[in-house]
Amino acid sequence: KESCDVQLYIKRQSEHSILAGDPFELECPVKYCANRPHVTWCKLNGTTCVKLEDRQTSWKEEKNISFFILHFEPVLPNDNGSYRCSANFQSNLIESHSTTLYVTDVKSASERPSKDEMASRPWLLYR
C-alpha cells in the first residue's frame, strides 16, 4: 500500500544551468494524499537555509503529483546557488534534497562555460 506521507521529489544532486535575464521556474514536485501541505522554498547559505519570504510562488497540479514553483522573473546573477523546498506535514518538517542553479551572466554568455565546467569550477559563475 502506498505511503500517505508527504514526499518531495527534487532529485538528489540536481543542477540547472540558466542565463541571467531569462525567466525560470524551479519546481518542487510534491506528493501528498488528502490535504495539500504548506510548502516553502529556502536558499542555502553555508549550512543554514534562508527562507525565501517575498518571492513569487505558485502551485501546478497534475494527476499524480503537484509542483510548488519558485519563479525567477528574471533570473539575477545573485540567484546562483543551492535551493531546497520543505513541507510541514502533521507537525513534521520534511526537507527536499537541494538543487543547484548555475547562473551565467548574460554579458559573458558569448564565452559561456560548459555545464560540466560550471559544476566543477563554480568560481566561473562569478566572472
Epitope: Q7, Y9, K11, R12, Q13, S14, E15, H16, S17, H97, S98, K115, D116, A119, S120
Partner: antibody
Framework: QVQLQESGPGLVKPSGTLSLTCADS????????IHWVRQPPGKGLEWIGR????????RYNPSLKSRVTISSDKSKNQASLKLSSVTAADTAVYYC?????????????WGQGTTVTVSS | DIVMTQSPDSLALSLGERATINCKSS???????????LNWFQQKPGQPPKRLIY???KLDSGVPDRFSGSGSGTDFTLTISSVQAEDVAVYYC?????????FGQGTKLEIK
C-alpha cells in the same frame, strides 16, 4: 519492469567517433538520471558520466571529459553517448544504467551492454 | 577523484565457507543528507552488473540473505555467510556520493 537497451556500431575506426544510444522502455527518463559505464575486455568498470534528461545537465569523468558528450531526447525516451578521437584503449563493453531516484539513488537497472571495438 | 580500493583482488573458497570482501574509499562517503551512498554489484561472465546492496547494508529484492553489507565512513565490507556455486562472480563496490562516481577494481570469487 525497467528495460534499457544500448545500440550502435560495433566497430569504430581509430580517431573516429563512437556513438551509442540507450533506449528506456520501462520508465520516463526525465524522472531519473541515465549513466554510461564501460568495461574494457577482462578489466573493471569505469564510470563515464551521467545526464539529467529533465534539463540536459551532465557530469563527466574528468579522464574522458574532453572527448565525451552525453545527451538525451525526452520525446524518444532515450539517451546518447558520443566519444571522439577513439583509440584501441576505448575498446570495451558500454553499458547504460538508470539511477533509481528517491530515496536510494543508485544504479538499479542496467542494459545488457554493447561491445565496441576500435580497429581499422 | 575518490579512489575505491578493494581487497583481496581474488579469493578461492570451498562451498559453505564465509567470504569477506573489503572496500576502502579515499574520502568519507557520508553525504550531506546523512546517507552513505555505497553500493555493491555482482557481475557474472557475459552479464551486466547486478545491484546486490545499496546504502551500505540494504539488500536488493531477490538477493539471498546470505549476502550482507556493513561499514561506515571510508571502510565497507561485503560478506557472504555461506558461499554457494552460483556466487562465482566479480564483485564491485561503487560510490554514489561524490563526482566523479567511482568503482573499486573488483574482487573475483572462485570455488576451490
Amino acid at each position: 519492469q525497467v528495460q534499457l537497451q544500448e545500440s550502435g556500431p560495433g566497430l569504430v575506426k581509430p580517431s573516429g567517433t563512437l556513438s551509442l544510444t540507450c533506449a528506456d522502455s520501462g520508465f520516463n527518463i526525465k524522472d531519473t538520471y541515465i549513466h554510461w559505464v564501460r568495461q574494457p575486455p577482462g578489466k573493471g568498470l569505469e564510470w563515464i558520466g551521467r545526464i539529467d534528461p529533465a534539463n540536459g545537465f551532465t557530469r563527466y569523468n574528468p579522464s574522458l571529459k574532453s572527448r565525451v558528450t552525453i545527451s538525451s531526447d525526452k520525446s524518444k525516451n532515450q539517451a546518447s553517448l558520443k566519444l571522439s578521437s577513439v583509440t584501441a584503449a576505448d575498446t570495451a563493453v558500454y553499458y547504460c544504467a538508470r539511477e533509481d531516484g528517491y530515496p536510494y539513488y543508485t544504479l538499479d537497472s542496467w542494459g545488457q551492454g554493447t561491445t565496441v571495438t576500435v580497429s581499422s | 577523484d575518490i579512489v575505491m580500493t578493494q581487497s583481496p583482488d581474488s579469493l578461492a573458497l570451498s562451498l559453505g565457507e564465509r567470504a569477506t570482501i573489503n572496500c576502502k574509499s579515499s574520502q568519507s562517503l557520508l553525504d550531506v543528507d546523512g546517507k552513505t551512498y555505497l553500493n555493491w554489484f555482482q557481475q557474472k561472465p557475459g552479464q551486466p552488473p547486478k545491484r546486490l546492496i545499496y546504502l551500505v547494508s540494504k539488500l536488493d529484492s531477490g538477493v539471498p540473505d546470505r549476502f550482507s553489507g556493513s561499514g561506515s565512513g571510508t571502510d565497507f565490507t561485503l560478506t557472504i555467510s555461506s558461499v554457494q556455486a552460483e556466487d562465482v562472480a566479480v564483485y564491485y563496490c561503487w560510490q554514489g556520493t561524490h563526482f566523479p562516481r567511482t568503482f573499486g577494481q573488483g574482487t573475483k570469487l572462485e570455488i576451490k
